[in-house]
Interface confidence: low
């Protein structure tokens, strides 16, 4: 696979050094350098400078540009789903439905059969079907903690709509948690958004699996819709494949 | 600017059509097709199919992939800083300073001076510096929508930390709106993250420019570094240029 | 990752990202950028072999399509993957200004 | 943006994306993929040229760049910009897999 | 041979700390999750915690949650147990355990160590 | 949490008899994999406790065949056929599907 052209480093430099004096005048829609006959003697103001730092320096909070893809992430990824455990499950007793939050338990022994391990998951995706909404509803999405407590995860302004619609959280960061630990029952938290001076903090949106009075020939499409984790991962035999060509170079 | 090479189109497409051929069986790890002879006959399950349409569907709020840039962020961004509006000001006086929120205000003329027309901004980030932090706190920013209601932008998950640190929220579309209308003062509420059934909704978080009792030597340090709009934005001469070349292609 | 911690530590001789350091001043013979003095805008070179045909079937081929050829191009070719901005200060007339270049500074390369 | 908009409706000569529908069957021979039956896979195709010497610093040239040489490459070529994956449907012995290939539809092309 | 060793069990007053460390070999310490569990004298068992083989996660019996921090290296083959703000009901003497999980096909723990006695009085 | 009642508390029992230990928990050890995650441990005096079942019936290794678990649900039985001297000590049931795990309170055996 080698070329037999030899490369005169040098000249490749020097090229792309002239390509960059055209850049630079190019990005800055320059013909030619701007003249410097009335620039100021002495250090730059201490204002220009600050505002060069702020521009410099990455800030938390500010999205970087996009990373290189990992080596892995070059191969194919099998594709499985796994559905919420119903809600007739014991799992659901102990949280109250209120008329802020839903709740979505899945089990990790299924995740586990789909992805034995976690560096082998690239990504999860929660999907729920919404239905019918009437009025704009902020959202916000929970994983299950400890014991009682939740931890916010990410939240979505759904607009109002005539017709069901399919959500999606990428959720891949807690679905690997959830492949390292030991429990049996993992879960999310679908609630309203409560701000602190807010009065009605009722969720209106209305998840397919959840709603109730429903007409016995429609439970299974129902069920099949009900909200479930669709999971991207690298099947265990590609992965030790990948391990062992990793130490090649 | 011309290559004098012709190019054999069908050459090309062959050539791709090969590479695509060791590609896919590449990225499937696979030495050469599998062998169909257990392929059971009929249709795919249901499953199967549902699972791959899962898969080919973009749904809601799912991140596609990047877009690619415009023509116009090529070029060059011109910078510029607008401070807030000192908390002394008349403006601040309407809005009590609760436990669960901190209010910056803004003036729209010193915006204008730096983008005169909303079309010219490309990015525009509030920036605050976050002092010392005991403890993690959630944080939600929202936008003065009209006379005493607000408008939820974004949130953020602040870690404990023993250092001061910058802050930065994309607040791009919200200062292209302020751009576009005729009012004078516009601004932002820090809030705690109140979640629906939560007990403690103060905003720990200390935010350089807020904190009172300062010794008066420090003012100014104080002040310099206090909320601003950090504004990236085409500069107008260029944006008149860039406009006429666009007829061009 | 054909990237700046993996290719300025090997002999990498196939598509890797380069050293180069921009000096203005030197390299440009330019004085009126005022900062930075300099900055790391390195550089894509190396080859991207065309590995398929069809009497190449086989597996040590294939395993080399992911550095070699990943976007299964009929001619592939050493380009930039991961970009850097870089911000600048110049004077226009009295004025100083604070710029940001887009995509100046190569972190890493790819066979595209 | 050099994409299928602008690409599949002119008759660019330069850098631009190319269109191309790959048929398992027919193209590739392959019964084994049984979803999709082929894909726009398409290609970049076309010149980027290298246009900066210190005898050509003028608008016309600079105005250039950013489609010719945007990273300022001492080759510059044309490349795949925007990539979009491909869900596959085929079996391993009697299982069906759904397995998403990325980076497969190139949607835009660029200097690079 | 699998063993585990435990050691660190020592007289402490109530509201004080201590870390108990355990040294594991015989086996490929990295690959198995690790669990402490404890008995006061005269009763039975109590689990205590666990860490999964990485180290990246932790689980806590609700009395220890907050006081309590599990913790392992596995280059050095040890697991930890930090115990801080003692009470007195925490005298027991601790085990160290090994846990087969579920996916390994058993949901049970084979191997304890000896014990190490901690006394929390004043 | 899920308690264990372990039943008798303690019993007494003639080399080469058999004894019978009974385990009851507050709700199904079923797991929803299917499984029931029930083990029986013993701890000799003076010693460590030791993984005699997993799984209500599957014997640890080294554990002789005179020791069988059954049950299914909640309830739960160990059965030791012909005792021998060195099977003193305490029986101890535990459940490791739901967390936080737990363990009964304990069964005394003696030999007379």
């Known amino acids: 696979l080698s070329t037999c052209k030899t490369i005169d480093m040098e000249l490749v430099k020097r090229k792309r050094i002239e390509a960059i004096r055209g850049q630079i005048l190019s990005k800055l829609r320059l013909a030619s350098p701007p003249s410097q006959g009335e620039v100021p003697p002495g250090p730059l103001p201490e204002a220009v400078l600050a505002l060069y730092n702020s521009t410099r320096d990455r800030v938390a909070g500010e999205s970087a540009e996009p990373e290189p893809e990992p080596e892995a992430d070059y191969y194919a990824k099998e594709v499985t789903r796994v559905l919420m455990v119903e809600t007739h499950n014991e799992i659901y007793d102990k949280f109250k439905q209120s008329t802020h939050s839903i709740y979505m338990f899945f089990n990790t022994s299924e995740l586990r059969e789909a992805v034995p391990e976690p560096v082998l998951l690239s990504r999860a995706e929660l999907r729920l079907l919404r239905l019918k909404l009437k009025v704009e509803q902020h959202v916000e999405l929970y994983q299950k903690y400890s014991n009682n407590s939740w931890r916010y995860l990410s939240n979505r302004l759904l607009a109002p709509s005539d017709s069901p619609e399919w959500l999606s959280f990428d959720v891949t960061g807690v679905v690997r948690q959830w492949l390292s630990r030991g429990g049996e029952i993992e879960g999310f938290r679908l609630s309203a958004h409560c701000s602190c001076d807010s009065r009605d903090n009722t969720l209106q949106v209305d998840i397919n699996g959840f709603t109730t009075g429903r007409r016995g020939d429609l439970a299974t499409i129902h069920g099949m819709n009900r909200p479930f984790l669709l999971l991207m991962a690298t099947p265990l035999e590609r992965a030790q494949h990948l391990q062992s060509s990793r130490h090649r170079r | 600017l011309s290559t004098c090479k012709t190019i054999d189109m069908e050459l090309v497409k062959r050539k791709r059509i090969e590479a695509i051929r060791g590609q896919i069986l590449s990225k499937l790890r696979l030495a050469s097709p599998p062998s169909q002879g257990e392929v059971p006959p009929g249709p795919l399950p249901e499953a199967v199919l549902a699972l791959y349409n899962s898969t080919r569907d973009r749904v809601a709020g799912e991140s596609a992939e990047p877009e690619p840039e415009p023509e116009a962020d090529y070029y060059a961004k011109e910078v510029t800083r607008v401070l807030m509006v000192e908390t002394h000001n008349e403006i601040y006086d309407k809005f009590k300073q609760s436990t669960h929120s901190i209010y910056m205000f803004f003036n729209t003329s010193e915006l204008r001076e730096a983008v005169p027309e909303p079309v010219l901004l490309s990015r525009a980030e509030l920036r605050l510096l976050r002092l010392k932090l005991k403890v993690e706190q959630h944080v939600e920013l929202y936008q003065k929508y009209s006379n005493n209601s607000w408008r939820y932008l974004s949130n953020r998950l602040l870690a404990p930390s023993d250092s001061p640190e910058w802050l930065s929220f994309d607040v791009t579309g919200v200062v292209r709106q302020w751009l576009s209308r005729g009012g004078e003062i516009e601004g932002f509420r820090l809030s705690a993250h109140c979640s629906c059934d939560s007990r403690d909704n103060t905003l720990q978080v200390d935010i350089n420019g807020f904190t009172t009792g300062r010794r008066g030597d420090l003012a100014t340090i104080h002040g310099m570094n206090r909320p601003f709009l950090l504004l990236m934005a085409t500069p107008l001469e260029r944006a008149q240029h860039l406009q006429s070349s666009r007829h061009r292609r | 990752a054909l990237d700046t911690n993996y290719c300025f530590s090997s002999t990498e001789k196939n598509c890797c990202v380069r050293q180069l350091y921009i000096d203005f001043r030197k390299d440009l013979g330019w004085k009126w950028i005022h900062e930075p003095k300099g900055y790391h805008a390195n550089f894509c070179l190396g080859p991207c072999p065309y590995i398929w045909s069809l009497d190449t079937q086989y597996s040590k081929v294939l395993a080399l399509y992911n550095q070699h050829n990943p976007g299964a191009s009929a001619a592939p070719c050493c380009v930039p993957q991961a970009l850097e901005p870089l911000p600048i200060v110049y004077y226009v007339g009295r004025k100083p200004k604070v710029e940001q270049l887009s995509n100046m500074i190569v972190r890493s390369c790819k066979c595209s | 943006a050099l994409d299928t908009n602008y690409c599949f409706s002119s008759t660019e000569k330069n850098c631009c994306v190319r269109q191309l529908y790959i048929d398992f069957r027919k193209d590739l021979g392959w019964k084994w993929i049984h979803e999709p039956k082929g894909y726009h896979a398409n290609f970049c195709l076309g010149p980027c040229p290298y246009i900066w010497s210190l005898d050509t610093q003028y608008s016309k040239v600079l105005a250039l760049y950013n489609q010719h040489n945007p990273g300022a490459s001492a080759a510059p070529c044309c490349v795949p910009q925007a990539l979009e994956p491909l869900p596959i449907v085929y079996y391993v012995g009697r299982k069906p897999k759904v397995e998403q290939l990325s980076n497969m539809i190139v949607r835009s092309c660029k200097c690079s | 041979e699998v063993q585990l060793v435990e050691s660190g069990g020592d007289l402490v007053q109530p509201g004080g700390s201590l870390r108990l460390s355990c040294a594991a070999s015989?086996?490929?310490?990295?690959?198995?999750?690790m669990d402490w569990v404890r008995q006061a004298p005269g009763k039975g068992l109590e689990w205590v915690s666990r860490i999964t083989n990485s180290g990246g996660t932790a689980f806590y019996t609700d009395s220890v949650e907050g006081r309590f921090t599990i913790s392992r290296d596995n280059a050095k083959n040890t697991l930890y147990l930090q115990m801080n703000s003692l009470k007195s009901e925490d005298t027991a003497v601790y085990y160290c355990l090994r846990y087969i999980t579920r996916a390994q096909l058993m949901g049970a723990w084979d191997y304890w160590g000896q014990g190490t006695q901690v006394t929390v009085s004043s | 949490a899920t308690m264990l009642t372990q039943s008798p508390g303690s019993l007494s029992v003639v080399p080469g008899e058999s004894a019978s230990i009974s385990c009851k928990a507050s709700q199904s050890l079923v797991h929803t994999d299917g499984k029931t995650y029930l083990s029986w441990l013993l701890q000799k005096p003076g010693q460590r406790p030791q993984l005699l079942i997993y799984q209500v019936s599957n014997r640890a290794s080294g554990v002789p065949d005179r020791f069988t678990g059954s049950g299914s649900g909640t309830d739960f039985t160990l059965k030791i056929s012909g005792v021998k001297a060195e099977d003193a000590g305490v029986y101890y049931c535990?459940?490791?599907?739901?967390?936080?795990?737990?363990f009964g309170s304990g069964t005394r055996l003696e030999i007379r």
């Open positions: 015989g086996f490929t310490f990295s690959s198995y999750w």
């Open positions: 535990a459940q490791s599907t739901y967390y936080p795990y737990d």
